[in-house]
């Protein structure tokens, strides 16, 4: 009871002057509040409150539910309290069966006692099951039993309050603990695709997946640098306790070029926030861009292989691809494949494999590709390098020696004279005339060169060598001369291949 100091308001006095009172069930509760400025009695138990404006609180036949705290308050707002236990052997506990706890916080199992003199007031698991080993609790007969630092693992734990009354263990109604998880990490967010490429009028739809321990995670789609509220749809699932997944789908039914930009899926919880972005590019129509992977002018040696390779971007996806040479379409020897297996891939590769090329197979090789919106092509000019071939070597009626050679690149013809029987011709002879015969002919064939020298310059027996050469190789032809008197005779010419 309060002590009184004169001159300042004092709290009311209660009769009986005790802090606690034990009443048997069925007996009377009579409490008197003594204060000249009496205002009210209030009764509290399990969050229920009753009021009484009489200064005497009388309950004629006390029940277990009358157990609780009785408080008298005066006009100065000062109060005094007495706690009354109504001992009922048939109802040892008052219970509020709702039991919620927040992870890492304490929670109260509301099972106050109606008899403070019982022993072993504690918690027990349902159906004789033991409580979790790490579960700690603190009993308070007037309030209930506090579970300390609730763990996630206690979710849906079934338990009873328990006490020993006259040597027997008594259990309360069961409680099911529901644990609200603490957010201990930011939400996990991911997006269905990192980038989207669409044509005007097509539908844009992107899904953000948010994972967290509770459905109380906030999420939204935002357009970067814009406050406009976007329309989104949600689907959600609980894959077990504390394993929640939400799919937030953003849709623009008919995308426009000015819808292009970066869209952010943002999520946050009480721990922090996370986001992921996707990029939308809307084009007014489709496109194809071709990038040669080798020079479009190709030089290859006779008999060797070459691969003509292009990469190309195509949107929408390519529908027709072909390689063409001399108005003929290749049915094989080429392959076309996506650069990556990524769903948003728009880059492709096409390769034409030309094997053991002949000199006659030079020319323009064209790659053509089309989609539903556009066509595109690229041409490769292929030149086949061939060693020179001497086509003719003759002594003309006018006394000229003429040598005609073909090859690519354009052969050079040199003349040499070998006196007598020497095998090595070293003295070079300047030609009288050199002509490129097909300079205006087909651009990719062999180039034909004609060179002539005046045989009258030779005064001795010997051999004249016509040597045609280029970057690939060389070939020679020989004219043998023998003098009989004053007559010069050409013995049969012959060629000698010099690789």
């Amino acid at each position: 009871q309060p002590s009184v100091s004169p001159g300042e308001p004092s709290p009311p006095s209660i009769h009986p002057a005790k802090s606690e009172l034990i009443v048997r069930v069925g007996n009377e509760i009579r409490l008197l509040c003594i204060d000249p400025g009496f205002v009210k009695w209030t009764f509290e138990i399990l969050d229920e409150t009753n009021e009484n404006k009489q200064n005497e609180w009388i309950t004629e036949k006390a029940e277990a539910t009358n157990t609780g705290k009785y408080t008298c308050t005066n006009k100065h707002g000062l109060s005094s309290s007495i706690y009354v236990f109504v001992r009922d052997p048939a109802k040892l506990f008052l219970v509020d069966r709702s039991l919620y706890g927040k992870e890492d916080n304490d929670t109260l199992v509301r099972c106050p006692l109606t008899d403070p003199e019982v022993t072993s007031y504690s918690l027990k698991g349902c159906q004789g099951k033991p409580l979790p080993k790490d579960l700690r609790f603190v009993p308070d007969p007037k309030a209930g039993i506090t579970i300390k630092s609730v763990k996630r693992a206690y979710h849906r734990l079934c338990l009873h309050c328990s006490a020993d009354q006259e040597g027997k263990s008594v259990l309360s109604d069961k409680f099911i603990l529901k644990v609200r998880p603490a957010f201990k990490a930011v939400p996990v967010v991911s997006v269905s695709k990192a980038s989207y490429l669409l044509r005007e009028g097509e539908e844009f739809t992107v899904t953000c997946t948010i994972k967290d321990v509770s459905s109380s995670v906030y999420s939204t789609w935002k357009r970067e640098n814009s406050q406009t509220k976007l329309q989104e749809k949600y689907n959600s699932w609980h894959h077990g306790d504390f394993n929640y997944e939400r799919q937030a789908t953003l849709t623009i039914s008919s995308a426009r070029v000015n819808d292009s930009g970066v869209f952010m899926c943002y999520a946050n919880n009480t721990f922090g926030s996370a986001n992921v972005t996707t990029t939308l590019e809307v084009v007014d129509k489709g496109f194809i861009n071709i990038f040669p992977m080798i020079n479009t002018t190709v030089f290859v040696n006779d008999g060797e292989n070459v691969d003509l390779i292009v990469e190309y971007e195509a949107f929408p996806k390519p529908e027709h691809q072909q390689w063409i040479y001399m108005n003929r379409t290749f049915t094989d020897k080429w392959e076309d494949y996506p650069k990556s297996e990524n769903e948003s891939n728009i880059r492709y590769v096409s390769e034409l494999h030309l094997t053991r090329l002949k000199g006659t197979e030079g020319g323009t090789y064209t790659f053509l590709v089309s989609n539903s919106d556009v066509n595109a092509s690229i041409a490769f000019n292929v030149y086949v390098n061939t060693k020179p071939e001497i086509l003719t070597y003759d002594r003309l009626v006018n006394g000229m020696l003429q040598c005609v050679a073909a090859g690519f690149p354009e052969p050079t013809i040199d003349w040499y004279f070998c006196p007598g029987t020497e095998q090595r011709c070293s003295a070079s002879v300047l030609p009288v005339d050199v002509q490129t015969l097909n300079a205006s002919g087909p651009p990719f064939g062999k180039l034909v060169v004609q060179s002539s020298i005046d045989s009258s310059a030779f005064k001795h027996n010997g051999t004249v060598e016509c040597k045609a050469y280029n970057d690939v190789g060389k070939t020679s032809a020989y004219f043998n001369f023998a003098f009989k008197g004053n007559n010069k005779e050409q013995i049969h010419p012959h060629t000698l291949f010099t690789p």
Partner: antibody
Framework: QVQLVQSGAEVKKPGSSVKVSCKAS????????ISWVRQAPGQGLEWMGG????????NYAQKFQGRVTITADESTSTAYMELSSLRSEDTAVYYC????????????WGRGTLVTVSS | DIQMTQSPSSLSASVGDRVTITCRAS??????LNWYQQKPGKAPKLLIY???SLQSGVPSRFSGSGSGTDFTLTISSLQPEDFATYYC????????FGGGTKVEIK
């Protein structure tokens, strides 16, 4: 024992909004899930959405997304459900119930609030 | 959304009868299924949670079973106060209820 006490019946015109309250007496209101479930005359039950006041984030059924707003005031242990753009088919009894989020069952129900939408 | 299909939609039974109501989910909901009883003009009342756990204060004649997609509510011996409408409800995705089963007096 905890009780959920709902506000009284409402008659509304089509196109208008209604805000229904639900006060929880006692208990740990802030970590309850409070949901709203409606029942049209002679029909079944339909979940509209819910909130855990401690987290402050409401979840809504797809059908009501953008038309319903659920809030909670921890200081008064009261949850609110506001439904906008009312139409005649929104005439129903609106219940608040404890549970309905994070796999909680509805273990406690208010008595319901009849909302009539009529021109 | 997950669809919940209850059958039958109504049934007539007598006091003392054993009554079985089934609920089928359109996809697996593990054991996140609850059963409610509703009487005319009243709010629903929770009977069974987590498919088979009896809510405190509910008579033991009510029982629930099943997991995945198929669930059953059984009333072992129907009492006069059991004539009502019964609803199942899933809690895995956006909450949905079954269409209800009305239990009437034969």
């Amino acid at each position: 024992q905890v009780q959920l006490v709902q506000s009284g019946a409402e008659v509304k015109k089509p196109g208008s909004s209604v805000k229904v309250s639900c006060k929880a007496s006692g208990g740990t209101f802030r970590i309850y899930a409070i949901s709203w479930v409606r029942q049209a005359p002679g029909q079944g039950l339909e979940w509209m959405g819910g909130i855990i006041p401690d987290f402050g984030v409401a979840n809504y059924a797809q059908k009501f997304q953008g038309r319903v707003t659920i809030t909670a005031d921890e200081s008064t242990s009261t949850a609110y459900m506001e439904l906008s753009s009312l139409r005649s088919e929104d005439t129903a009894v609106y219940y608040c119930a404890r549970g309905g989020l994070d796999t909680d069952e509805f273990d406690l129900w208010g008595r319901g609030t009849l909302v009539t939408v009529s021109s | 959304d997950i669809q919940m299909t209850q059958s039958p939609s109504s049934l007539s039974a007598s006091v003392g009868d054993r009554v079985t109501i089934t609920c089928r989910a359109s996809q697996s909901i593990n054991s996140y299924l609850n059963w409610y009883q509703q009487k005319p003009g009243k709010a629903p009342k929770l009977l069974i949670y987590a498919a088979s756990s009896l809510q405190s204060g509910v008579p033991s004649r009510f029982s629930g079973s099943g997991s995945g997609t198929d669930f059953t509510l059984t009333i072992s011996s129907l009492q006069p106060e059991d004539f009502a409408t019964y609803y199942c409800q899933q809690g895995v995705s956006d909450i949905t209820f079954g269409g209800g089963t009305k239990v009437e007096i034969k």
